[in-house]
C-alpha cells in the first residue's frame, strides 16, 4: 500500500520533471523553429507570406500635400521683404497602389529586380479642397532658369522671355498644376525642342521608380529586401564619396529580428540618398507588438555637427560653408534645378534658413519622420514619411523679375506626410499567424516548464513526507 | 529651311551712312534674336551688335556704340542695322547670325561694306 | 571684355593627320564655348557648341574638350575638304568674342 503511493509520488515527480524539461527544451527547439519559418517567409520569392504583400502593398498609402500659400509675393519681388507663408492642406491622394512590374528572379545571384509604377488618386473626401484650388507660390521656371543657365548672355535672353510671357517671382496656380504639370508660358517660348511642362512632381503619373535590384534572402536571410543596385547601377552618381552609395533596403521591410540597438539603413528615391533610423520607443500597433524607429535630427546636421554629412554638403554659398543644417541640395538629381529638401516648416533646421520665412511651425510629433517595424519579420507595418520641397531662388541682375533680390532664399513650395497603416483585417491575419503562433508557442513553453516543475516540486514534497512518515 | 540673306552693303565715303537688312525665313527672328558680326578683310571675327528675342534689349561692341543701331521689323521677318559716321576701319564683309543661347548656329552669305574716299 | 586666344595661328598638315587646335580663355568661360570653320570666301559653320557638342551634320572626326579657361578642337583624321580656318567664340558673357582665327594648310 506505502509502495503504491510512494510510486505514484515518483511517477508523478518524474512526468513533472519529464514536463519541465520538454518546456525547457522547447524554448531553443521553438525559437528555432520560428526562426526556421520566419527565415522561409520573409524570402523575397513566389509562395511566400513576404512575397505576396511586397508585389503588391496589403496597406493603403496616402500622400497628404499643404501647400505653402505666399501671402506677400508683390513686396518679395519688389522689396526683397521676408516671405509670408500660410499652409494649405492637406489635399490627399492615394499613392503605392500600384504591384510591382517586370519582376524577375535570378537564381545565381540571390536576386529579384523590379520596377515600381507611380500613381496618385485625389481623394475629396480626406481634402480640404479640390485639385482646382489656386496658391500663389513661386514661379519655378523663373527660378530655376538662372540657377540653370549661370551665363549672363543666356540670362538676358531669357530675361526677354519672362518679359514676352509676363511671367514674374511668383504666379498662382492650382493644386493640380503645381503637382503634376502645367505648360509654362516662359518656357514655351524658347524656341528649341525642350520640355516646357513644370510641376514639383513632374512626370509621376504613368512613370516606374526604378529598376530596384534587392537581394531576396534566399542564400542570406539578413540580406533580405537590401537593394543591390538602383537603375543598374550600385552608386547614385549625386554625391561624392560614400554618401553616394545605396544603402539599406525600400523601408517596406528589413531583414528579420531586427534588434533595438540596429540602425536602420535605407534608400529613398525621393530624397535621392540613402538614410537611416535609430530605435525611439515600443508601440502596441493593433494588439502587434512593434519597434517605432524615427529619423535622428544628426541625419540632417551641418558637417560640423555630423562629420558624417561632409558629402552631403557640396555646395559653399547657399551652405554658408557647410555651417548651415536642415536642408539638402538634391539639384543633381533633379537635372541642376535648384531643389532643397528638408523636414517640413524646416524641423531640424540652422536658424539661417528659416529665418527669411514667415509663418513656420515647426513640430517634432507632426514634422518627423517614422517606421514601426514587426521585429521578429522585419516588415514596416506603419510609417509616416515627412519631407519638404523648397526651391532656391537667387537675385539674378540681368533677369528683371529677380533683380531686386537683396539674398537668396530657400523657398518653401510645400511638405507632404506619406503615411501607410496596416488595415485591421491584415493586422488580424498577422497576430494569428505571427504574433499569435509565437506568443501561443511561449505560453505552453511557461506552461510546460511551469507546470512540471510545480508538479515535480509538489511531488517531491509529498514524497519526502510520506517517506519522514513511514520512518517514524 | 533656314535661310539669312543680308543686303544693302556698298561703297560710303568716311562719315556716310549706310543701312544693312537681313531677311530670315524658316524661323521668326523675334523668338531668336539676331546678331551682327563682321570680318575685315584678311582678318578675323569681329561680333558687331545683337537685338534680344521679342524686341528685348540691344546690345553693341564698343568699337560701334553710339554709332550704329540695330533694330528688326517682325512683320517683315527682317533684321536692320544702321550704320552711321562711318569710317575706314569698319570696312568688311557684314553677315547677320542667329543665336539664341550665344553660338551661331545659321549665317547669311554676307554682305561687303567698303568706307573708302 | 572676355579675350579668346587661339593657338596656333596656322599650321601645316597632311590628309589622315590629327590636328589640335587650342583656345584659351581670359577668364573662366565654364562651357561656353564654340568652334567655327570657314573656308574663303564663304560665311563660318558651326561645329562644335557647349565645348563638346558636335553640331548636327558635322563629322565625327571634329571634337571639342575642356571647360573653364582651357578649350581644344581636333581634328582626329584631317580630310582634304578640312583645310580652312577655325575660330573658337565664347557665348558666356556679352559683348561675345572670337579667337583671332588658326590656319590649317596643305603641307
Known amino acids: 500500500m506505502g509502495c503504491d503511493r510512494n510510486c505514484g509520488l515518483i511517477a508523478g515527480a518524474v512526468i513533472g520533471a519529464v514536463l519541465a524539461v520538454f518546456g525547457g527544451i522547447l524554448m531553443p527547439v521553438g525559437d528555432m523553429l520560428i526562426e526556421k519559418t520566419i527565415k522561409r517567409e520573409v524570402v523575397l520569392e513566389e509562395g511566400t507570406t513576404a512575397f505576396k504583400n511586397w508585389v503588391k502593398t496589403g496597406t493603403t498609402v496616402y500622400r497628404q500635400f499643404w501647400i505653402f500659400d505666399v501671402q506677400n509675393p508683390d513686396d518679395v519681388a519688389k522689396n526683397s521683404s521676408k516671405i509670408k507663408v500660410k499652409q494649405r492642406g492637406p489635399y490627399t491622394y492615394r499613392v503605392r497602389y500600384l504591384a510591382k512590374e517586370n519582376i524577375t528572379q535570378d537564381p545565381e545571384d540571390h536576386t529579384v529586380s523590379f520596377v515600381q509604377p507611380n500613381g496618385a488618386i485625389f481623394e475629396p473626401s480626406l481634402s480640404v479642397g479640390t485639385e482646382d484650388d489656386n496658391f500663389t507660390v513661386l514661379n519655378l521656371a523663373v527660378a530655376a532658369a538662372p540657377h540653370i543657365y549661370q551665363n549672363s548672355f543666356v540670362q538676358v535672353v531669357l530675361n526677354s522671355l519672362i518679359k514676352k510671357s509676363k511671367s514674374s517671382m511668383f504666379q498662382t496656380r492650382s493644386l493640380k498644376e503645381l503637382l503634376w504639370g502645367y505648360k509654362d508660358p516662359f518656357l514655351s517660348l524658347v524656341p528649341y525642342p525642350i520640355s516646357t511642362t513644370v510641376g514639383v512632381f513632374y512626370p509621376y503619373n504613368d512613370t516606374v521608380d526604378g529598376v530596384y535590384k534587392v537581394f531576396n534572402g534566399k542564400d542570406n536571410i539578413s540580406k533580405v529586401a537590401i537593394i543591390e543596385s538602383y537603375k543598374g547601377k550600385r552608386n547614385l552618381s549625386y554625391w561624392p564619396s560614400y554618401c553616394d552609395m545605396i544603402n539599406g533596403t525600400d523601408a517596406a521591410s528589413f531583414p528579420p529580428f531586427v534588434e533595438k540597438s540596429r540602425t536602420l539603413r535605407f534608400f529613398s528615391s525621393d530624397i535621392c540618398r540613402s538614410i537611416y533610423a535609430v530605435f525611439g520607443s515600443e508601440i502596441d500597433l493593433k494588439g502587434i507588438p512593434v519597434y517605432r524607429f524615427v529619423l535622428p535630427a544628426n541625419a540632417f546636421a551641418s558637417p560640423l555637427q555630423n562629420p558624417d554629412n561632409h558629402c552631403f554638403c557640396t555646395e559653399k554659398v547657399i551652405s554658408n560653408n557647410c555651417t548651415s543644417y536642415g536642408v539638402l541640395d538634391i539639384g543633381k538629381c533633379k537635372e541642376g534645378k535648384p531643389v532643397y529638401i528638408s523636414l517640413p516648416h524646416f524641423l531640424h533646421a540652422s536658424p539661417d534658413v528659416s529665418e527669411p520665412i514667415e509663418g513656420l511651425h515647426p513640430n517634432e510629433d507632426e514634422h518627423r519622420t517614422y517606421l514601426d517595424v514587426e521585429p521578429i519579420t522585419g516588415f514596416t507595418l506603419q510609417f509616416a514619411k515627412r519631407l519638404q520641397v523648397n526651391i532656391l531662388v537667387k537675385p539674378a541682375r540681368k533677369i528683371e523679375a529677380l533683380k531686386n533680390l537683396k539674398r537668396p532664399y530657400i523657398v518653401p513650395i510645400l511638405w507632404l506626410n506619406e503615411t501607410g497603416t496596416i488595415g485591421d483585417e491584415k493586422a488580424e491575419m498577422f497576430k494569428t499567424q505571427v504574433t499569435g503562433k509565437i506568443k501561443l508557442l511561449g505560453m505552453v513553453e511557461m506552461a510546460l516548464l511551469g507546470i512540471g516543475v510545480v508538479m515535480f516540486v509538489a511531488f517531491m514534497i509529498s514524497y519526502c513526507a510520506c517517506k519522514s512518515k513511514n520512518g517514524k | 529651311e533656314v535661310q539669312l540673306v543680308e543686303s544693302g552693303g556698298g561703297l560710303v565715303q568716311p562719315g556716310g551712312s549706310l543701312r544693312l537688312s537681313c531677311a530670315a525665313s524658316?524661323?521668326?527672328?523675334?523668338?531668336?534674336?539676331i546678331h551682327w558680326v563682321r570680318q575685315a578683310p584678311g582678318k578675323g571675327l569681329e561680333w558687331v551688335a545683337w537685338?534680344?528675342?521679342?524686341?528685348?534689349?540691344?546690345y553693341y561692341a564698343d568699337s560701334v556704340k553710339g554709332r550704329f543701331t540695330i533694330s528688326a521689323d517682325t512683320s517683315k521677318n527682317t533684321a536692320y542695322l544702321q550704320m552711321n559716321s562711318l569710317r575706314a576701319e569698319d570696312t568688311a564683309v557684314y553677315y547677320c547670325?542667329?543665336?539664341?543661347?550665344?553660338?551661331?548656329?545659321?549665317w547669311g552669305q554676307g554682305t561687303l561694306v567698303t568706307v573708302s574716299s | 571684355d572676355i579675350q579668346m586666344t587661339q593657338s596656333p595661328s596656322s599650321l601645316s598638315a597632311s590628309v589622315g593627320d590629327r590636328v589640335t587646335i587650342t583656345c584659351r580663355a581670359s577668364?573662366?568661360?565654364?562651357?561656353?564655348v564654340a568652334w567655327y570653320q570657314q573656308k574663303p570666301g564663304k560665311a563660318p559653320k558651326l561645329l562644335i557648341s557647349?565645348?563638346?557638342s558636335l553640331y548636327s551634320g558635322v563629322p565625327s572626326r571634329f571634337s571639342g574638350s575642356g571647360s573653364g579657361t582651357d578649350f581644344t578642337l581636333t581634328i582626329s583624321s584631317l580630310q582634304p575638304e578640312d583645310f580652312a580656318t577655325y575660330y573658337c567664340?565664347?557665348?558666356?558673357?556679352?559683348?561675345?568674342?572670337f579667337g583671332q582665327g588658326t590656319k590649317v594648310e596643305i603641307k
Open positions: 557647349y565645348a563638346t
Open positions: 537685338i534680344a528675342p521679342y524686341g528685348g534689349e540691344t
Open positions: 524658316g524661323f521668326t527672328i523675334d523668338s531668336f534674336g
Open positions: 577668364q573662366d568661360v565654364s562651357n561656353w
Open positions: 547670325a542667329r543665336s539664341f543661347f550665344g553660338y551661331f548656329d545659321y
Open positions: 567664340q565664347q557665348h558666356s558673357n556679352a559683348p561675345l568674342t
